[in-house]
């Protein structure tokens, strides 16, 4: 919406634009208006940008008015929250940034017979971007001075210079994001993609063999395993082998066979030859022992002098036999030499998946964390290890435990701090996540838990000399009483600075006003009106541009007055035979210098830019994608690095192209699945996925690969009459009219007779960008003065 707030009004004499008083007549003594004050209200008209503002024509962006808000002079800067002095013009279109604003102060007549009268009017053409900040404007010429402020604000969830970028925070399966101050989506932790609905997998998760639907997860494809899905699953039953691809069984050194279960180095693996026997590999899982003297048997285990060498280990007793010797083993040992520990783990007595460790003449169970006891038959109390980090309590469950988390914590061990930041912080504040809470870090000028409160910078009463303090965002403004100025009202105002008196008059400063001592030929508050000397002093025609009149204001006693027939843009040059010519200022031509030269004649704007003629100047409004004084520079659409996932960006006109890598698709290489999403085609275009590319079907008025270039068709043929310039605006257009014309297609002749340019009851005749005064008897001159 466009907002305008009237701040102050100064109409010292209570006059109207036509010089009359708002109410009643003038005091004959001091020529000031007597009786009633003006009943001042304001009218506002907002329309398309005009280089030369015209008063008529429709208010295409909206219009409104205030009620009567004051008299001759008033100051509303202190009255915040008072909507009487505010006009709000909502708009349902993209804000075009450039605009023309007409503000008129009117006197309400308070009766049905008399029409309201205009006091003063201001016009302003410019450019304004949406912002919370106000822009102050002043009307400082004419009978009344007034000050007002304007701003454009976007509706909730709308951003950008045109208030046409939509972003509404969300946290559900469609997306998990907040919006930054420019309306860009900022993904919550753990999410990515243009809609923030693609989970960021566990760090290190194989992009080729793993995927996830939830943040921090890593789900393996068939044939892959491990925390990061980067380990292949070997062939089932593969014993001493590995894999590079799923289901392989590549044998380790010295192993063979389809499942790598055949020992090719039995001697090295088992060292079967005892008593210094030499081992030779004879085939897979086969060997032969060469025994030293005094030993025999397949493993050289038989000693001829049996018990002499203490063959029985582990406290076994030796007995010589006909075959050699026999060992009687101590408990827990077995084998011909008592060197084999009896496997007390067969059968396995460990419950609940416990691992059995064989001991000498016994066993030990290594239990999983949830179980304890000799055979892991008892439920372990996991709470003894204090696994719960930030919890009210730990509950022991059978083969498990449960942490009852303190507020703000989650996860099995209550060690994950819940993110409490969900867009509660206002006014662009940043949010810091705390435990079971959050803290808003406010920008300057704001306070409160959610930065919702504007700090009152007026609390310290900074304004001096009775100035009224007005609190604003991160600053204050002092509204000074009459006679004082300065940011703290610390300066005594000099009303003569800058000098308001015209035509060389002397200015005298007073307590709350000024006084101009006029030269003999001038009168009025500011000595701006030429006295009508012709009532008393005879005038002499010097030439067709000059008259002379008697004056005691010059040494020669004569004053020369120049004709203003050439208007404000030229000087009169006298010619013989009572004729004259006009010497025009730069940028103007015509008999009376009333025509603005068309500086766009040479077509200076390139690349489809539209030229708007000014006074001895021009301005180029560039087609989408171009910038510069002559629209000569192609805007680099790759500057924001729009291509994701290693895509290479190529700049086009008002567009870019991403050359995607590694199977990524879409306008910005952001998708694995589709070339299309809602942002691919602009301006209502429909996106079609064509496999390895996308295609946009554009609505009327748009063209280009992503419907990003406005067709000139809305300006062909030129709909603007009387030399108006057509500016393409999507499917529509805007006409920038030449001087003297107005309206949406420049078809209406501006009323050059408004407001009354002819004095002394002269009649005004309106032409095309000119007027003529037909004077009453006894009066002459271009304006009958």
């Amino acid at each position: 919406q466009f907002e305008l707030e009237i701040l102050s009004m100064q109409n010292v004499n209570g006059e109207l634009q036509n010089g009359n008083c708002c109410g009643g007549a003038r005091n004959p003594g001091d020529r000031k208006c007597t009786r009633d004050e003006c009943d001042t209200y304001f009218k506002v008209c907002l329309k398309e940008y005009q280089s030369r503002v015209t008063a008529g024509g429709p208010c295409s962006f909206g219009s409104g008015s205030t009620p009567v808000i004051g008299g001759n002079t008033f100051n509303l800067k202190a009255s915040r929250g008072n909507d009487r002095n505010r006009i709000v013009l909502p708009f349902s279109f993209a804000w075009p940034r450039s605009y023309t604003l007409l503000v008129e102060a009117w006197d309400s007549s308070n009766d049905t017979v008399q029409p309201d009268s205009i006091i003063e009017k201001a016009s302003h053409s410019g450019m304004i971007n949406p912002s919370r900040q106000w822009q102050t404007l002043k009307q400082n010429t004419g009978v009344a001075h007034f000050e007002y402020q304007i701003r454009v604000t976007c509706d909730d969830y709308y951003y950008g210079f045109g208030c046409n970028k939509f972003c509404r925070p969300r946290d559900d399966f469609f997306g998990h994001y907040a919006c930054d101050q420019n309306g860009n989506k900022t993904c919550m932790e753990g999410w990515m993609g243009p809609e923030c609905n693609r989970a960021i997998c566990r760090q290190g998760c194989s992009p080729k063999h793993g995927s996830c639907k939830l943040p921090g997860d890593c789900r393996c494809q068939y044939g892959w395993q491990g925390l990061y899905c980067d380990k292949c699953i070997p062939h089932p039953g593969c014993v001493h082998g590995i894999c590079n691809e799923p289901w392989q069984c590549l044998c380790e050194t010295n192993w063979g066979g389809q499942l790598c279960d055949k020992d090719l180095n039995y001697c090295g693996t088992h060292q079967p030859c005892l008593n210094g026997g030499t081992c030779s590999n004879t085939g897979p899982d086969k060997y032969q022992c060469s025994c030293p003297e005094g030993y025999s048997g397949p493993n050289c285990e038989i000693a001829e002098h049996a018990c002499l060498s203490d063959p029985c280990h582990n406290r076994g007793s030796c007995k010589e036999t006909s075959l050699g010797f026999e060992c009687e083993c101590s408990p827990g040992w077995t084998g011909p030499t008592c060197s084999t520990n009896i496997d007390d783990c067969s059968p396995n007595n460990c419950s609940h998946g416990g691992t059995c460790q064989d001991l000498v003449n016994g066993f030990k169970c290594v239990c999983p964390p949830q179980w304890t006891g000799k055979t892991c038959q008892l439920d372990a109390n996991e709470c003894e290890a204090k696994p719960c980090v930030n919890a009210k309590s730990c509950k022991n469950l059978i083969a498990s435990y449960y942490c009852d988390c303190l507020p703000g914590w989650m996860g099995q061990n209550c060690d994950i701090n819940i993110n409490d930041c969900l867009g509660q912080c206002q006014n662009d504040a940043s949010c810091r996540d705390l435990v079971n809470g959050y803290r808003c870090i406010c920008p300057p000028g704001y306070a409160g838990d959610h930065c919702e409160r504007d700090i009152d910078e007026c609390a310290s009463n900074p304004c001096l000399n009775g100035g009224h303090c007005q609190n604003e965002i991160n600053r204050f403004q002092c509204l000074c009483p009459t006679g004082f100025s300065g940011n703290l009202c610390q300066l005594d105002i000099d009303y003569c600075e800058p000098n308001p008196c015209q035509n060389g008059a002397q200015c005298y400063n007073r307590a709350s006003d000024y006084f101009c001592k006029c030269p003999e030929d001038y009168e009025g508050k500011n000595c701006s009106h030429l006295k009508d000397h012709c009532r008393t002093t005879p005038c002499e025609v010097i030439d067709s541009c000059t008259v002379a009149m008697a004056s005691n204001d010059t040494p020669e006693g004569v004053r020369y007055i120049s004709s203003n027939v050439c208007g404000p843009h030229g000087k009169c040059k006298s010619q013989s035979g009572g004729k004259f010519t006009c010497d025009c200022n730069k940028g103007f031509t015509g008999t009376y210098c009333h025509e603005n030269i068309n500086d766009c004649e040479s077509n200076p704007c390139r690349n489809g830019g539209t030229c708007i003629d000014g006074v001895n100047s021009y301005k180029c409004i560039c087609s989408d994608g171009w910038e510069g004084a002559y629209c000569e520079t192609n805007i680099n659409d790759c500057s924001q690095n729009p291509c994701h996932n290693g895509g290479t960006c190529r700049d086009l006109v008002n567009d870019f192209y991403c050359d995607c890598k590694n199977g990524w698709k879409g306008k910005t290489c952001h998708s694995r699945d589709s070339q299309c999403d809602e942002a691919t085609c602009n301006n209502g275009g429909t996106c079609y996925d064509e496999g390895d590319a996308f295609k946009c079907m554009c609505p009327g008025g748009w063209e280009g690969t992503t419907c990003n270039i406005a067709r000139n068709s809305s300006c062909l043929p030129n709909p603007c009459h009387n030399g108006g310039t057509c500016v393409v605006n999507g499917e529509s257009f805007t006409c920038v009219c030449k001087e003297g014309w107005e309206g949406p297609i420049c078809a209406q002749n501006t009323n050059d007779c408004s407001p009354h340019p002819c004095y002394n009851s002269g009649t005004c005749v309106d032409g095309d960008n000119w007027y003529r005064c037909e004077c009453a008897p006894g009066f002459a001159g271009p304006d009958c003065r």
């Epitope: 939509f166 509404r168 925070p169 946290d171 469609f174 809602e678």
Partner: antibody, heavy 119, light 107 residues
Framework: EVQLLESGGGLVQPGGSLRLSCAAS????????MSWVRQAPGKGLEWVSS????????YYADSVKGRFTISRDNSKNTLYLQMNSLRAEDTAVYYC????????????WGQGTLVTVSS | DIQMTQSPSSLSASVGDRVTITCRAS??????LNWYQQKPGKAPKLLIY???SLQSGVPSRFSGSGSGTDFTLTISSLQPEDFATYYC?????????FGQGTKVEIK
């Protein structure tokens, strides 16, 4: 008061088509995601499809993907479900439901419309 | 897809009893869990969203807790109008999935 009113249910033969509508009132329709949830006779709830507020994103259950299409007309405050190639197992009461932009819960439900697929 | 498992499938209780229903997710879903109540022939009604937030207009005897994979719906003092079927639902990622339901009957 928020109101969701489903219509368009009825008896249809296997392989046939139906179009369900859900008329919404009492809230700003264009600000909310909408969904269809169904319930076969004597069974639990099964999510069918969802569409976000602008109609840019849609999601479907695997069981209906390629056969059902969800859409919306924000100017008419209406949600639609176009059901093609209907099967006996699609027989259910179909509910439309609205979701606020945080947490994805279904905060308001319609009263449902019965779809029977039988020869 | 994320599986949601409710227990028990049904339970019998008396007016005034404290009733607890649990819901377990096959993967961690943070706090994206909602609870619904459904009476025969009626549409479901939202009770709890985001694991523990009470929907406006729902009596305070209903409460929710849990995060990650394990969640609980508690009715502190069962009232006659609370006899119904209760469903949990995850809403973090599509496809959205419901638990199979828990029927609360009069003992």
């Amino acid at each position: 008061e928020v109101q969701l009113l489903e219509s368009g249910g009825g008896l249809v033969q296997p392989g046939g088509s139906l179009r369900l509508s859900c008329a919404a009132s009492g809230f700003t329709f264009s600000s909310y995601a909408m969904s269809w949830v169904r319930q076969a006779p004597g069974k639990g709830l099964e999510w069918v499809s969802s569409i976000e507020q602008m109609g840019w994103q849609t999601y479907y259950a695997d069981s209906v993907k390629g056969r059902f299409t969800i859409s919306r007309d924000n100017s008419k405050n209406t949600l639609y479900l176009q059901m093609n190639s209907l099967r006996a197992e699609d027989t259910a009461v179909y509910y439309c439901a609205k979701s606020p932009p945080f947490y994805g819960q279904f905060d308001y439900w319609g009263q449902g419309t019965l779809v029977t697929v039988s020869s | 897809d994320i599986q949601m498992t409710q227990s028990p499938s049904s339970l019998s209780a008396s007016v005034g009893d404290r009733v607890t229903i649990t819901c377990r997710a096959s993967q961690s879903i943070s706090s994206y869990l909602n609870w619904y109540q459904q009476k025969p022939g009626k549409a479901p009604k939202l009770l709890i969203y985001a694991a523990s937030s009470l929907q406006s207009g729902v009596p305070s005897r209903f409460s929710g807790s849990g995060s990650g994979t394990d969640f609980t719906l508690t009715i502190s003092s069962l009232q006659p109008e609370d006899f119904a079927t209760y469903y949990c639902q995850q809403s973090v990622v599509a496809p959205l999935t419901f638990g199979q339901g828990t029927k609360v009957e009069i003992k």
